[in-house]
Amino acid sequence: TLNSVLNSNAIKNLPPPLGGAAGHPGSAVSAAPGILYPGGNKYQTIDNYQPYPCAEDEECGTDEYCASPTRGGDAGVQICLACRKRRKRCMRHAMCCPGNYCKNGICVSSDQNHFRGEIEETITESFGNDHSTLDGYSRRTTLSSKMYHTKGQEGSVCLRSSDCASGLCCARHFWSKICKPVLKEGQVCTKHRRKGSHGLEIFQRCYCGEGLSCRIQKDHHQASNSSRLHTCQRH
């Protein structure tokens, strides 16, 4: 089945991550967050892993998370890193491999019977403890889409947009992530001018809905860079 293949280690001959294989003609040689680049060799294994730059976890694979490669490194330089297995140290849920989540700084198994209660506890902890964070990282009080049986409604805690019902996306709200409505035409949106700026928002907006893109509002072209208003507009 689809589930079993995705969760197995059956795929051994993975091409390198975006950026292409060394010496592979026609491969892309650079990558930018938000863009998939083709390239690679069918026979190359994951041992030849090349880092993929990212701004948020959603840009990485399901078995990866987005972070600075060096401890205490420049937050502006982030790449997709391999997820942490059970009993490994973590700072947020996305760091743990599918089927696990981050509890008290350690990746633990997502026991479906106890999971929701513990997630709710974690939220209470982080809000009740002066928004404290672990190792300077905000806690990601969310859970893997694999844990859900029903899609989250507006306001539900989430890990990724696939956890949310149709018309909603998973966006940061304080030190958690919740399902929020996808933006409609004319609504104000956020255009990230530099990589990693997503991390500065504690009230993250959803992306623009299908057929819309986040562009400068026409009558704001003359305004200064910092005050330019972006809205969702038809392509």
């Epitope: 689809l2 995705l6 975006l18």
Partner: nanobody
Framework: EVQLVESGGGLVQAGGSLRLSCTAS????????VGWFRQAPGKERELVTA????????YYADSVKGRFTISRDNARNTAYLQMNSLKPEDTAVYYC??????????????????WGQGTQVTVSS
């Protein structure tokens, strides 16, 4: 076993638009890369566009950039391909395919494990 079903193909005049849908059975759809491939008569199958599990990463072939838009709705187990400003050279059978998105990169054609039957798109001049 996952099944992918494409719909939305048809005959359209040059400059027109079509929207293809790819509906999947299988609860792990939200963990996959979805790609749209096309094959014109006498030509090799080519990757047109792809989207990662979350929709945060996309890829477009140079020939369709600015005209085609890929999107997905994981709640509906569906991916979409909006095709605008269609040209006669876009005429082909369009296939939807899905594969594991464990690592951030584009899959090679060989790694797309599930394929639809294809839908014909014909652009007349």
């Amino acid at each position: 076993e996952v099944q992918l079903v494409e719909s939305g193909g048809g005959l359209v005049q040059a400059g027109g638009s079509l929207r293809l849908s790819c509906t999947a059975s299988g609860s792990a759809f939200s963990s996959t890369v979805v790609g749209w491939f096309r094959q014109a008569p006498g030509k090799e199958r080519e990757l047109v566009t792809a989207i990662n599990w979350s929709g945060a990463r996309t890829y477009y072939a140079d020939s369709v950039k600015g005209r085609f838009t890929i999107s997905r709705d994981n709640a509906r187990n569906t991916a979409y391909l909006q095709m605008n400003s269609l040209k006669p050279e876009d005429t082909a059978v369009y296939y939807c395919a899905a594969g594991s998105d464990r690592y951030a990169r584009v899959l090679t054609e060989y790694e797309y494990m599930w394929w639809g039957q294809g839908t014909q798109v014909t652009v007349s001049s």
